[in-house]
């Protein structure tokens, strides 16, 4: 079982080397700023939105090619439940930084869990997200 | 009504330390990352430093690294930079930002001077 | 450490005319997400620094539409299409893909 497991673990990470999830990271953040820009962010903000909505953003349709793109790349990662948590961390991991807000984390957080579900695949029933907050000191 | 209020500054010799604060209201303060911004006098705009929600990550400029600390108190609604062996070069208005979220300075307080001086 | 470069640093304007702010930065300020981590702020005098634009094109709320902000990479591009006489005071571009740094600032005076 652990010569399994050891071979499980080198074929999730050559799969993740393999993947790119540039196009589930874009559309992420394309998404929780639509939807910010359609709701309001800021619940102590002053009468207006503290940012004004983006034409680009408001399109959608970069959105979801970047959707679509997301899902093939995710597809690989069906048949190993474990594997497709991995590269959930990978991409919290990987813009963790760009999200300097407590909202703006949740909902990032909160895509990604659906990400599975909204590209039709099995979304991995125990999966920890949790980066420190406010993004990791990088630099 | 947003609202960030700096105080602490003054005049001070070089070597000695200071302590800035800003006071948070109206805003999510302990929401969001804060920022310390500097203009020194006929000069632009210096990034200083920067604290995460949390507190768990801290960022610095490399002119304050070491020198510097930033740190924040969320019972209080205050964010604080502690600055130690001040130089001449130091001496500015400190302004203290909220982020919007997304890496960008999104509510700034009216700033508070800085004068190292002998 | 990113540097950002400005010019002009000075640029006298006529009320009613066109202005651009030119930005170029020492390296790519795309992220893997797709997005310009370039900011403009304008610092009018008196007053504290507020945001205008933010990743490279997105206005920010109260921000009149006489403002935009184009490019991406290293090279960014601020344009008022009509300069009124509140514009007046330092523009600064700001980039926050690695912690943050400002431009030197171009100060825009009426002619």
């Known amino acids: 079982r652990q010569q399994w497991e050891l071979q499980g673990d080198r074929r999730c990470q050559s799969q993740l080397e393999r993947a790119n999830l540039r196009p589930c990271e874009q559309h992420l953040m394309q998404k929780i700023q639509r939807d910010e820009d359609s709701y309001g962010r800021d619940p102590y903000s002053p009468s207006q939105d503290p940012y004004s909505p983006s034409p680009y953003d408001r399109r959608g349709a970069g959105s979801s090619q970047h959707q679509e793109r997301c899902c093939n790349e995710l597809n690989e990662f069906e048949n190993n439940q474990r594997c497709m948590c991995e590269a959930l961390q990978q991409i919290m991991e990987n813009q963790s930084d760009r999200l300097q807000g407590r909202q703006q984390e949740q909902q990032f957080k909160r895509e990604l869990r659906n990400l599975p579900q909204q590209c039709g695949l099995r979304a991995p029933q125990r999966c920890d997200l949790e980066v420190e907050s406010g993004g990791r000191d990088r630099y | 009504q947003v609202q960030l209020v700096e105080s602490g500054g003054g005049v001070v010799q070089p070597g000695r330390s200071l302590r800035l604060s800003c006071a948070a209201s109206g805003i999510a303060f302990n929401d969001y990352t804060m920022h310390w911004v500097r203009r020194a006098p006929g000069k632009g705009l210096e990034w200083v430093a920067a604290?995460?929600?949390?507190?768990?990550?801290?960022y610095y400029a490399d002119s304050v690294k070491g020198r510097f600390t930033i740190s924040r108190d969320s019972s209080k609604n205050t964010l604080y930079l502690q600055m130690n062996s001040l130089r001449a070069e130091d001496t500015a208005v400190y302004y203290c930002?909220?982020?919007?979220?997304?890496?960008?300075?999104?509510?700034w307080g009216q700033g508070t001077l800085v004068t190292v001086s002998s | 450490e990113i540097v950002l470069t400005q010019s002009p640093l000075s640029l006298p304007v006529t009320p009613g005319e066109p202005a651009s702010i030119s930005c170029r930065s020492s390296q790519s300020l795309v992220h893997r997400n797709g997005y310009n981590y370039l900011d403009w702020y304008l610092q009018k005098p008196g007053q504290s620094p507020q945001l205008l634009i933010y990743?490279?094109?997105k206005r920010a709320s109260g921000v009149p539409d006489r403002f935009s902000g184009s490019g991406s990479g290293t090279e960014f591009t601020l344009k008022i299409s009509r300069v009124e006489a509140e514009d007046v005071g330092i523009y600064y571009c700001m980039q926050a893909l690695q912690t943050w740094t400002f431009g030197q600032g171009t100060k825009v005076e009426v002619n």
């Open positions: 604290i995460s929600y949390g507190g768990t990550n801290k």
């Open positions: 990743m490279a094109s």
């Open positions: 930002a909220r982020d919007s979220g997304y890496r960008s300075l999104l509510h």
